[in-house]
C-alpha cells in the first residue's frame, strides 16, 4: 500500500511534585515501521528513561504508537519528540503549560 504519514500529537500531564509526564503519540500512519523518541537538547534520551507503547493497528488500515518520559517542570523547552517514518523526519516541542495539545500532520 501507499505511504501514509503520521499525525504527531504531544501532550503533558502532571506526574508528581515538580515533574510532568510528556507523551508523544503518532497515529494514522502506514507502513507500521516508525522511529519515535524523546530528545533532550537534541540528544536522544537513554532507553530506560522512556516508555514505549506497542505499534498497533487502529482498525482503519493504519497504525499508532507512543513514547513517554518524565521531565522536570520548567525544562520543557529542552525536550522534543523526534519522529522518523518512511524517510521523512520531524521534531515536535512540548506544549506550554496552558496548552495541552499540539497536532502536526506530516506529508
Amino acid at each position: 500500500g501507499s505511504t501514509v504519514p503520521p499525525m504527531v500529537n504531544v501532550t503533558r500531564s502532571e506526574a508528581s511534585e515538580g515533574n510532568i509526564t510528556v507523551t508523544c503519540r503518532a497515529s494514522g500512519f502506514y507502513p507500521w515501521n516508525i522511529t519515535l523518541s524523546w530528545r533532550q537538547d537534541g540528544v536522544s534520551l537513554s532507553h530506560d528513561t522512556q516508555q514505549w507503547g506497542d505499534v498497533l493497528p487502529d482498525g482503519n488500515g493504519t497504525y499508532q504508537t507512543w513514547v513517554a518520559t518524565r521531565i522536570c517542570q520548567g525544562e520543557e523547552q529542552r525536550f522534543t519528540c523526534y519522529m522518523e517514518h518512511s524517510g521523512n523526519h520531524s521534531t515536535h516541542p512540548v506544549p506550554s503549560g496552558n496548552s495541552h495539545h499540539h497536532h502536526h500532520h506530516h506529508h
Epitope: Q51, G53, D54, V55, L56, D58, G59, N60
Partner: antibody, heavy 122, light 112 residues
C-alpha cells in the same frame, strides 16, 4: 482502573436481534481498545472483535463478521455490540473487556465487565 | 486460526503445592510488531476472567509474585509456586498476536 458496566440479561427469540451495551467510567474512553468475548456455559472463551474508541476502527474474528456489529458512542462513553439473526447457538455470556493503550500494560483484556447473559429461546 | 492447546485439562493440587500449566500454540505467536502477546487469565466460578500474565512473563498489577510465566516459540508455561485457596479456578492461555485471537481450552485447578 475504572468501571465497565454491562447491560442486563436478555431473553430473545430466534431470528431477532439484540444490542448489548458496555458503559464505562473512570478512565479516558478514547484511549482504549474495547473487545467483546463470548463464553458458553462450561466452555472456553471466544474473541469476537475489538473496536478502538479513539477512531471507531475495528477488527473482527471472521467467524462473527456477519453476526456482530461493534460501535462506540464517545459522548456517553459506551461501547455497543449488536447481535443479529440469533439462534440457540448464540446463547452465552458476552463480556466486554478493555486494553488501555496509553497505560502500562501490553495486555488485551486488562479490565473486564461482569458479562451479559443472552438466552435465545422460542 | 492459531490453535492453543492446554495441558492438563484438570490439575488436582494440595494447598502449598507448586502447580504448572502448559500451553502450546499451533504456530509461532510473534506479532508483526515483534511482541509476543501470550497472556494468562484466571476465571473463578460465576466471575469474569482476570488477567494474571501478559507478554509471556509480565505480571499484571496486583498479581502475587507466586505466579510466573515463561516460554517462547510455541511452548509456554504458567507456574504457581505455592497454591493458595484463592488460586482455584479455570486458567486460560490466550494469544493476541494473530487474528483471530484465540484461547486455550482451559485448565481447572482444584483441590486433591
Amino acid at each position: 482502573q475504572g468501571q465497565m458496566q454491562q447491560s442486563g440479561a436478555e431473553l430473545v427469540k430466534p431470528g431477532a436481534s439484540v444490542k448489548l451495551s458496555c458503559k464505562t467510567s473512570g478512565f479516558t474512553f478514547s484511549d482504549n481498545y474495547i473487545s467483546w468475548l463470548k463464553q458458553k456455559p462450561g466452555q472456553s472463551l471466544e474473541w469476537i472483535a475489538w473496536i478502538y474508541a479513539g477512531t471507531g476502527g475495528s477488527s473482527y474474528n471472521q467467524k462473527f463478521r456477519d453476526k456482530a456489529q461493534l460501535t462506540v458512542d464517545t459522548s456517553s462513553r459506551t461501547a455497543y455490540m449488536q447481535l443479529s439473526s440469533l439462534t440457540t447457538e448464540d446463547s452465552a455470556i458476552y463480556y466486554c473487556a478493555r486494553h488501555d493503550y496509553y497505560g502500562t500494560s501490553g495486555a488485551w483484556f486488562a479490565y473486564w465487565g461482569r458479562g451479559t447473559l443472552v438466552t435465545v429461546s422460542a | 486460526d492459531v490453535l492453543m492447546t492446554q495441558t492438563p485439562l484438570s490439575l488436582p493440587v494440595s494447598l502449598g503445592d507448586q502447580a504448572s500449566i502448559s500451553c502450546r500454540s499451533s504456530q509461532h505467536i510473534v506479532h508483526s510488531n515483534e511482541n509476543t502477546y501470550l497472556e494468562w487469565y484466571l476465571q473463578k466460578p460465576g466471575q469474569s476472567p482476570k488477567l494474571l500474565i501478559y507478554k509471556v512473563s509480565n505480571r499484571f498489577s496486583g498479581v502475587p509474585d507466586r505466579f510466573s510465566g515463561s516460554g517462547s516459540g510455541t511452548d509456554f508455561t504458567l507456574k504457581i509456586s505455592r497454591v493458595e485457596a484463592e488460586d482455584l479456578g479455570v486458567y486460560y492461555c490466550f494469544q493476541g498476536s494473530h487474528v483471530p485471537w484465540t484461547f486455550g481450552g482451559g485448565t481447572k485447578v482444584e483441590i486433591k
